[in-house]
Structures are given as C-alpha cells and as structure tokens.
C-alpha cells in the first residue's frame, strides 16, 4: 500500500507525459490524478515507466473503479494489462473486438497467460458464442486457442465459424474434441465438390466416422498417411483393405512404416492376410486363411 | 538479424558539438525504446536517456538536460544522438541500446559503440 | 539516484572455478535487476533479467538471485569465454544506473 502524501509544489502532473518517470513511487500516488491518468490511459504505453511505475498507476486506476474499468480504460491499458490479475479481468465486460485485439496484441508472441485466458472468456461469454470474427482474431493470436477449449465449449461453434480455421489450428485437438468439431466443418464446407471438399475436410477428420471414409474412398482423394494416423482407430477398423487402398491412393505404400502404430496395426488384426497380400506391401499378422471372424460387436447390439 | 549498428568514430574539439547515429535493422521501432548509455575510457556504464522512435519523445537523465537531444528518422529506422559543448569529460565510446516497451529499462540488444574523443 | 556497488571490482579465478559477484543496491529495487557481460572493445551482453531469469541464449552456468537491496551472479563452471567484466544494472527507477564492474581475469 502507498502511503498518502502531499504532493510536492509544482509537482503536479497536468498531463501523463514523459517527466513522469523520474518521479518517485509516492511522487506519482500524490501528484498525478486518477481521473487525469483514465483519460489520457493511451498515453501511458508510450512511455517508458518501470515495473514499480506501472504498480502504482494500476493502484490509481483501482481506487477509481473499485467495480472494474470502463471498457473506454481497458481498451487503451497497453502494456499495463500485463499487471492485471485474473481476478481483476473477472470485473470487466468487454464487449468490443476492438478492445479485445488491443489487448491480446499486448501479448503477442507469448503464451497464453492466465490473464488473456480469462479476458478471452469474458468476452466470449459475453457474446454468447464463438463467433467468426472472434475466431479469426483468436486463432490469428493463438493457433492453438480451438484445441484449449472442451468439447462442451465447442459445441457453442456456430459452423460458419469453421471457415476461420487452419489446419495448424487443430494441431493439437484430441479426438473428442475433432468429435464435435467434424460434424459442424462437414455442414460448413457440404456445398464444396469433391477435391475442394477433401481440402478443407482433412484436418478435421480425427472425428470422421467409418460411413464418411467409405464414402470419401470412393472419390479419389489420396488421403497422405499422416491424416490417416489420426483417424479414430474404431472408424477405420470396419474399412475393407479395397476402401483403404481406394483411401489412400499412391500412399498405400505408407502402410507398411506404420504397421506397427495404431490404427494401422489394430486394422491389419481384423483383415483377412489374404486380402493383405493382395497390397504386395508384405504387412503381416491378418486372419489366417480358413478362420472364421464372428462379428460379436453386431451380436451384442442385437442382445 | 536483429541489429543496432552505430556511425564511425568521431574527434572533436572542446565546445563543439557531435552527432552519433544508430541504425535499427531486423526489428521495427515500433514496441520498442532506445537508450544512449556512455562509456569513458577504463569507466563503467552511465545512461544518458531513452528515446521513443515512434513518437521521438524523450526523457534525459539530469546532467544531460540542455546539452544533448535524441532524435528519430522512422522512414530509415535510425536515431540520432546530439551532443553539445563537448569537454574532455565527454571522450567516451557512446551505446545505444534496446528495450521492449513492456520492460523499458532492460537493453537486450547493444550497438557496436561509436568512440568519440574531445582533444583541442 | 539509487546507487549500485559492485563486489569484488576484480577477481582472478581459473577455469572450471564456482564464482559468484555481489551487487547491493542503495534502496529496496525489488526484483528489478539486470546482469550484463562486456569482453574488451565489445558491447555489453544482457545476461540476467529481473534478477534471476536467463536471457535466451545464454549457458544455463549463469544463474542470478536476490531480491530487494542485494543480488548475486552465479558462474558454476568457469569457461574460458568467460572472463570478462560483469555489470548489475537497477531498473527500478529512473535514472537507470550500473555498478562500477567486476573484471573477471585468469589465474
């Protein structure tokens, strides 16, 4: 807590300016207006204050809005919102896209504070759905921003939205996430043919199921192995070896790197070694020829 | 690559005047402040003052009040260091520095120094 | 102005050597220090900020500690890149000001 004291004689600040920054701590607390320091907040970041400063402007600031800043403050705090809590973020109701690329910009290149993490959903919430402007200026700020939220949070993702999204944005989603965000990028992107369609489609396959890969075997499309290394492994276990071959095109050749790595491994389990061979890629460990496969999983639904 | 590369050396006469530029490369100005820090033979460091390219605003350190001036040119991406009334006292290798605007007082990245030596 | 007093001005050290350098300030500057290196007819290097955390780049046998008056820089492992002269710098408050140097030289 600063101490009150009285200002100096001719130290009172009339304007934010540069002079600032040889005053000392208490200096500033006494000489410079709280009121003066809201209005003229878009000055602050132009000017070199340290760390010790920008405390005690913050403290100013505090004192003034004891229920959260204005949205006129937020939008112009700079670098001084790297001194803001969480808690504090909590008070505010951002509202403007504005406001919110401000801020992020302040952070730009570092991680995701805990900070940024609690304006971004303010903001969000505020709003009532991730919408597309919103995710354009996350994704843009953060590629990882759609794979940080729940698949209960991405079920608010209008499928318009999905248009925003780069492949490197879902580098890091996990399938339960593609789960909910496959169906709304394949209502999104439905009015494509069949090339363009793959294009735009291919990131979010992790959350395909099996009747989709069938249907995209038929058309071509030359799926590369490391798309297929990322598909549910119970969406590509009912795959016969022609739809997979059909799949994956030239990249068939693939299969045999990753025989052993799901789902690849646990797919060759269920198919016949004779209908293996016929790949000529010398992938092993199939049905034997004369077995019999009982599909129980059919048998159970029935029960 | 992320630069600061400053003029060539200077020899001036008591009472005259120098100025010292500093070019910025690989960074643009914009998010970050300057600094002129000065280094008398055999001496340690002392700051002179800190400019802000964007805007050319300034704040010098007391002794430096009067007798110097830091400028800007945005459109080659270079400060300038004016320094008047030149004494023996001011013979020194002359820095510019940069800091974040985030963190103003800490110079991550140095000029390579311009020497300038007061001698009647 | 706050004043920063570097200790020892000078040390002799041989390689592989643990070496530490105090620096003290005349006030309480928090965490708000920074360690730099300077080899002869070179620039600084910044080594050390906020008292404690590694600038990119440079050999984790750096280490820095201390809060509020005193700070310390730590080399584990002398190397022979080593030897240089070292500089604390205050950022707490304007004007910014540097300890008078420790010259690092071989034994």
């Known amino acids: 807590e600063v101490e009150k004291t009285a200002c100096p004689s001719g130290k009172k600040a009339r304007e934010i300016d540069e002079s600032l920054i040889f005053y000392k701590k208490w200096e500033l607390e006494a000489c410079v207006d709280a009121a003066l320091l809201a209005t003229q907040m878009d000055r602050v970041n132009a000017i070199p204050f340290t760390y010790e400063q920008l405390d005690v402007l913050k403290h100013k600031l505090d004192e003034l809005y004891p229920q959260g800043y204005p949205e006129s403050v937020i939008q112009h705090l700079g670098y001084l919102f790297l001194k803001m809590s969480p808690e504090d973020i909590r008070k505010w109701n951002v509202t403007s896209l504005e406001t919110l690329k401000a801020l992020l910009e302040v952070n730009k290149g570092h991680e995701m504070s805990p900070q940024v993490a609690t304006l971004i959903d303010r903001f969000v919430k505020g709003r009532g759905q991730l919408d597309k402007d919103t995710l354009d200026t996350l994704t843009a700020f953060y590629p990882g921003y759609l794979c940080s939220l729940s698949p209960e949070e991405l079920s608010s993702v209008p499928p318009s939205s999905i248009w925003a999204v780069r492949p490197q944005d879902l580098d890091t989603c996990d399938p339960r996430q593609l789960d909910v965000l496959y169906p709304k990028a394949r209502l999104a992107f439905q009015n494509m043919n069949g090339s363009e369609y793959f294009v735009k489609i291919q990131s979010f396959l992790g959350g395909a199921p099996t009747e989709d890969l069938k249907a995209l075997s038929q058309q071509n499309v030359s799926m590369d192995l490391a798309t297929f290394m990322k598909l549910r492994t119970d969406a590509v276990l009912p795959l016969t070896v022609a739809e997979v071959q059909k799949l994956l095109g030239p990249h068939v050749e693939g299969l045999k790197a990753e025989e052993r790595h799901r789902p690849v491994r646990d797919w060759i389990l269920r198919q016949r070694q004779d209908d293996l061979d016929t790949l000529g890629l010398g992938l092993q460990g199939g049905i034997p020829n004369g077995y019999l496969v009982l599909d129980l999983s059919m048998q159970e639904a029935l029960s | 690559q992320v630069q600061l590369v400053q003029s060539g050396a200077e020899v001036k006469k008591p009472g005259a005047s120098v100025k010292v530029s500093c070019k910025a490369s690989g960074f643009t100005f914009i998010g970050y402040y300057l600094h002129w820090v000065r280094q008398a033979p055999g001496q340690g460091l002392e700051w002179m003052g800190i400019i802000n390219p964007s805007g050319g605003r300034t704040s010098m350190a007391q002794k430096f009040q009067g007798r110097v001036s830091m400028t800007t040119d945005t459109s080659t991406g270079t400060v300038y260091l004016d320094l008047g009334r030149l004494g023996s006292d001011d013979t020194a290798v002359y820095y510019c520095?940069?800091?974040?605007?985030?963190?103003?007082?800490?110079?991550?990245?140095w000029g390579n120094g311009t020497t300038v030596t007061v001698s009647s | 102005d706050i004043r920063m007093t570097q200790s020892p001005s000078s040390l002799s050290a041989s390689v592989g050597d643990r070496v530490t350098v105090t620096c003290q300030a005349s006030?309480?500057?928090?965490?708000?220090l920074n360690w730099y290196q300077q080899k002869p007819g070179k620039a600084p290097q910044l080594l050390i900020y906020?008292?404690?955390d590694l600038e990119t780049g440079v050999p984790s046998r750096f280490s820095g500690r201390g809060s509020g008056r005193d700070f310390t820089l730590t080399i584990s492992s002398l190397q022979p890149e080593d030897f240089a002269t070292y500089y604390c710098?205050?950022?707490?408050?304007?004007?910014?000001?540097f300890g008078g140097g420790t010259k690092l030289e071989i034994k």
């Open positions: 520095a940069r800091a974040d605007n985030w963190n103003a007082g800490s110079m991550d990245v």
């Open positions: 710098q205050q950022l707490n408050s304007y004007p910014l000001t």
């Open positions: 906020d008292a404690s």
């Open positions: 006030e309480d500057i928090n965490n708000s």
